[in-house]
Amino acid sequence: TPEVWVQVQMEATELSSFTVHCGFLGPGSISLVTVSWGGPDGAGGTKLAVLHPELGTRQWAPARQARWETQSSISLALEDSGASSPFANTTFCCKFASFPEGSWESCGSLPPSSDPGLSAPPTPVPILRAD
């Protein structure tokens, strides 16, 4: 069964910077990745970035840079301009659309007591969508 993993990492050098790492474990080719925060895509979450293997990437503030790490994983850098970080309590979700599996989504967040540089363990909560 395909699975999506999500890791949220606070940058050790800059406490207002975070990186979300997401990956797809399974066969098939990725056709689109959508990253959202505050909840799943299409279910109350706010779209932060979309990545397409051919059409490129788009991101919306507070996202700063979305990029492919491998053919099946991505990273998204976020910059919190506020004095206190809302990211610490926020859920980030990654949805991978792949052929022929369909869409799989998983969410993760920064552990409440994490030290800078530590990341949340993978928290796959797959949501199968019949697209």
Epitope: G45, T46, V50, G56, W60
Partner: antibody, heavy 119, light 106 residues
């Protein structure tokens, strides 16, 4: 086809408030950011802010924080911009525009709403 | 905030000719620039995004290029319907328009 239909022209008095509407059709309203843009007479375009209809999350140009408030009504696929404490500086054309994501920013625009603030 | 300096602010060209508009960003915008045509009484029209990607239905007379901080927009084989004001927009971080270029035909 994608369409954004804005409310009609308005003549308002200084100090008043105005809510401009932008009704979307032809696509899934909750999937795309809606932006608002200002154009003063004879001037260029200025980005006011955006709202993501799926969550109601907003992001404003610092210049317009406190004067513009963006909201949506998902049930009617309508975006709104409330302009408060109007002054003559608010006299302008206001446009809503959809963000097309990978198809480019502001790929569809409303026809504009002209606001005149005068005593 | 990223600033966009667009030049020239106005230009006049002959039918069938070619014009080029420049936008310079205050920092690298990673090719995240779009170009719009705006005619009075209408909403602007997206012509090009991501520096050089032509929007569906836009004639190939319109083109874009550039990288880093410097970007260019050209119209070749000018037609009378091209009379309009043209704007660049950076969308690498938030959104900033250039000041606009008013195109007139000689």
């Amino acid at each position: 086809q994608v369409q954004l239909q804005q409310s009609g022209p308005e003549l308002m008095k200084p100090g008043a408030s105005l809510k401009i509407s932008c009704k979307a059709s032809g696509y899934t309203f909750t999937d795309s950011y809606i932006n608002w843009v200002k154009q003063r007479p004879g001037q260029g375009l200025e980005w006011i802010g955006w709202i993501f209809p799926g969550s109601g999350s907003t992001y404003y140009n610092e210049k317009f924080k406190g004067t513009a408030t963006l909201t949506v009504d998902k049930s009617s696929s309508t975006a709104y911009m409330l302009l408060s404490s109007l002054t003559s500086e608010d006299s302008a054309a206001y446009f809503c525009a959809r963000d097309g994501g990978l198809r480019g920013p502001f790929d569809y625009w409303g026809q504009g709403t002209t606001l005149t603030v005068s005593s | 905030d990223i600033q966009m300096t667009q030049s020239p602010s106005s230009l006049s060209a002959s039918l069938g000719g070619k014009v080029t508009i420049t936008c310079k960003a205050s920092q690298d915008i990673n090719k995240y620039i779009a170009w719009y045509q705006h005619k009075p009484g209408k909403g602007p029209r997206l012509l090009i995004h991501y520096t050089s990607t032509l929007q569906s239905g836009i004639p190939s007379r319109f083109s874009g290029s550039g990288s880093g901080r410097d970007y260019f927009f050209s119209i070749s084989n000018l037609e009378s319907e091209d009379i309009a004001t043209y704007y660049c927009l950076q969308y690498d971080h938030l959104l900033t328009f250039g000041g606009g270029t008013k195109l007139e035909i000689k």
